[in-house]
């Protein structure tokens, strides 16, 4: 495929990545799927600076990111190593809380109103952020 060299319309470029900020809500899996259909992934936060960038754009609103522990350990959707990477959990989080009465625990991570992270029920309809890296090969076939 061809390399993407600039961001699609309505996406925001920052540090060689493109970001799209939703204004509606979806369950985590639907948000994840939405990003994949855009040849992107739910946002993966790898630094203090990227955290600040995303925080600035989403404001004080619960927003899904590309981090989950639905299969056991916490994993970033793009394969970024969780254990050695940037983290910004709220105190006492993640707690895999079962007391919400919706069945199961809490397996998906989101930005809270102050930007710090919380784990929550993946079915909650939160906003989300998609990210795609510039210079990565796009899935579209090259123009002949």
């Amino acid at each position: 495929g061809s390399e993407r060299t600039c961001c699609p319309v309505n996406w925001v470029e920052h540090e060689r990545s493109c970001y799209w900020f939703s204004r509606s809500g979806k369950a985590w899996a639907d948000a994840d799927n939405y990003c994949r259909l855009e040849d992107a992934h739910l946002v993966v936060v790898t630094s203090w600076e990227e955290q600040k960038f995303v925080q600035h754009h989403i404001g004080p609103v619960n927003t899904w990111m590309g981090l989950h522990d639905q299969n056991g350990p916490w994993k970033w959707v793009d394969g970024t190593d969780y254990e050695t990477g940037f983290k910004n959990w709220r105190p006492e989080q993640p707690d895999d809380w079962y007391g919400h009465g919706l069945g199961g625990g809490e397996d998906c991570a989101h930005f809270t109103d102050d930007g710090r992270w919380n784990d929550d029920v993946c079915q909650r309809p939160y906003r989300w952020v998609c990210e795609t890296e510039l210079d990565k090969a796009s899935q579209e076939p090259p123009l002949l």
Epitope: W48, E49, Q51, K52, H56, F86, K87, P91, G115
Partner: antibody, heavy 118, light 107 residues
Framework: QVQLVESGGGVVQPGRSLRLSCAAS????????MHWVRQAPGKGLEWVAV????????YYADSVKGRFTISRDNSKNTLSLQMNSLRAEDTAVYYC???????????WGQGTLVTVSS | DIQMTQSPSSLSASVGDRVTITCRAS??????LNWYQQKSGRAPKLLIY???SLQSGVPSRFSGSGSGTEFTLTINSLQPEDFAIYHC?????????FGQGTKVEIK
């Protein structure tokens, strides 16, 4: 009320080590990130290091990376800074500061003076 | 690293004056700019955070504005207790960096 009290400063020879401590009270220490910031005599402020509330992240200024180590003991409400291979340019008043929302220093200690001199 | 440049480095003013201090960042820091006041021999005190939010307990004569790379701290009607050094500080990215300070002296 929030209180931060630094200790451990003093005169030390170049190349030697020193350990600073910051005793916190008046707030839930384990819920806040903490920083060290220093100020050389007659100079401006210089950020030194930060540690997350749960120790998941630690960051350092390039000038101290590999020589200084920030740590905390949430059970004792204590922040520490282990300073090795000290240099004359590390001479400063060292402040501990509480982090309110990723890099906002909302409370500071009174500072402890470190003098590196032969 | 992001360089923070304050101007002026010092100024003389009288009680009742309106004082403005400028801080410029070497790159876009959005609104992640904080202001601190430091009196002689004392620890700094937070005045303004995220460019324009007044810290609890700080008098309303202090205000902040700006975004991106240019920021200002304004003191309306300077009071005797306001004579001090003022520092700007970016919290957009590590390493966190400060301006060199602005000393506000009595004229």
């Amino acid at each position: 009320q929030v209180q931060l009290v630094e200790s451990g400063g003093g005169v030390v020879q170049p190349g030697r080590s020193l350990r600073l401590s910051c005793a916190a009270s008046g707030f839930t220490f384990s819920s806040y990130g903490m920083h060290w910031v220093r100020q050389a005599p007659g100079k401006g402020l210089e950020w030194v290091a930060v540690i997350w509330h749960d120790e998941t992240n630690k960051y350092y200024a390039d000038s101290v990376k590999g020589r200084f180590t920030i740590s905390r003991d949430n059970s004792k409400n204590t922040l520490s800074l282990q300073m090795n291979s000290l240099r004359a340019e590390d001479t400063a008043v060292y402040y501990c500061a509480r982090d309110e929302r990723l890099g906002i220093f909302d409370y500071w200690g009174q500072g402890t003076l470190v003098t590196v001199s032969s | 690293d992001i360089q923070m440049t304050q101007s002026p480095s010092s100024l003389s003013a009288s009680v009742g004056d309106r004082v403005t201090i400028t801080c410029r960042a070497s790159q876009n820091i959005r609104n992640y700019l904080n202001w601190y006041q430091q009196k002689s021999g004392r620890a700094p005190k937070l005045l303004i955070y995220v460019a324009s939010s007044l810290q609890s307990g700080v008098p309303s004569r202090f205000s902040g504005s700006g975004s991106g790379t240019e920021f200002t701290l304004t003191i309306n009607s300077l009071q005797p207790e306001d004579f001090a050094i003022y520092h700007c500080h970016q919290s957009n990215s590590t390493p966190l960096t400060f301006g060199q300070g602005t000393k506000v002296e009595i004229k």
